[in-house]
């Protein structure tokens, strides 16, 4: 006899990286007929939704209207059908950004390189942080962690055209509190035809929406975002 229901799916809209004082929605998708959803934050009950009518709803939304460092951390959700509870969802790491200062991102030998050349990014922030994160716009899984007193090195090694794209970095005050994003650095690799359209193998943020980390929220893509957001979050842990 089944003792628990399948785990629900959890994700954040518009994104798991939330600028401070901005709104974010945590979505939890379970099964039709679920009479109760619970959202847990850092292991404690945070919110409860009992959708009506339950047979017509399989997703609930928990709003956080004003993101701050107290609300940043690990969230999970569960749901109940009758008396039977689900397994807990994967952990969602909610990160608050735009904290304190703005790092500087530079690239050596330069932003235009030849395929096969060794490239290193440098992220510098003069305030009290020792962890840095380099993100390539596009797939959220392109996150690298680096350490240093005021600067971290991110060696990419010999680059290929797959490394092309726009990079930003953050200083991290803890796993869930990040600085403002750096100004973007666009890496061009010889042979690359500049293309700003969404490529299926590497979906990208439109350049003008990066500042607020907006993602397209078409229903069909929400799960995909959560999947690759989750990959990025694994790097945070």
């Amino acid at each position: 006899q089944q003792q628990t229901l399948p785990k629900p799916f959890i994700w954040a809209e518009p994104h798991f990286m939330v600028p401070k004082e901005k709104q974010v929605t945590i979505c939890c998708q379970g099964n039709y007929g679920a009479v109760e959803y619970q959202l847990h934050f850092e292991g404690s009950l945070f919110a409860v939704d009992r959708p009506k009518p339950p047979e017509r709803i399989n997703k609930v939304q928990f709003y956080i209207p004003d993101m701050n460092s107290r609300m940043a951390g690990q969230y999970s959700c569960i749901y109940r059908v009758g008396e039977l509870w689900s397994e807990p969802s994967n952990l969602l790491d909610l990160v608050v950004t735009e904290m304190y200062d703005t790092p500087t991102l530079s690239v050596h030998p330069g932003p235009e390189v030849i395929s096969g050349e060794k490239v290193t990014f440098y992220c510098r922030l003069d305030t009290a942080t020792s962890m840095f994160l380099l993100l390539k716009e596009g797939r959220s899984s392109h996150v690298q962690r680096g350490y240093g007193k005021v600067q971290a090195e991110f060696p990419l090694g010999p680059v290929t055209t797959a490394h092309r794209g726009t990079y930003r970095c953050f200083g991290s005050y803890n796993n869930h509190a990040w600085s403002f994003p750096s100004e973007p650095v666009k890496l061009l690799v010889t042979g690359d035809i500049e293309n700003t359209s969404l490529a299926p193998e590497d979906p990208t943020f439109p350049a003008d929406t990066w500042g607020t980390y907006l993602l397209t929220t078409e229903t069909g893509l929400q799960k995909d975002h959560a999947l690759w957001d989750h990959t990025a979050q694994n790097l945070l842990r």
Partner: nanobody
């Protein structure tokens, strides 16, 4: 901006009842989930009960279930906490709280964590003693 003012606290004997009120100012009150919390001397703040903006969903801390009832009257911009079968351990300052007012909350959602609440009253003291 929402302002909250609690009333109805006082001294009551064990087994007695009290009804706390939380009057809110601000046009958005009727769309905000609310809750009651309490803090006993020398202890951490503790969740008591929560209610959705519609009043259709409620949630209680286990130790209050069956004894306390949370309700609201949006036409009066007021929330209530009816407390029955009071015990000495219910002695505390009781606070009402409302969430931030910039989001379209589900009519059935309640928040149980103090960190979710942006607006707080000044509290009303409930003393249960013979």
């Amino acid at each position: 901006e929402v302002q909250l003012v609690e009333s109805g606290g006082g001294l009551v004997q064990p087994g007695g009842s009290l009804r706390l009120s939380c009057a809110a100012s601000g046009r958005t009150f009727s769309r905000l989930p609310m809750a009651w919390f309490r803090q006993a001397p020398g202890k951490d703040r503790e969740f008591v009960a929560a209610i959705s903006w519609s009043g259709g969903s409620t949630y209680y801390a286990d130790s209050m279930k069956g004894r306390f009832t949370i309700s609201r009257d949006n036409s009066k911009n007021t929330a209530y906490l009816q407390m029955n079968s009071l015990r000495a351990e219910d002695t505390a300052v009781y606070y009402c709280a409302a969430v931030g007012d910039s989001a379209p909350y589900s009519a059935t959602i309640v928040y149980t964590d103090a960190r979710a609440y942006a607006y707080w009253g000044q509290g009303t003291l409930v003393t249960v003693s013979s």
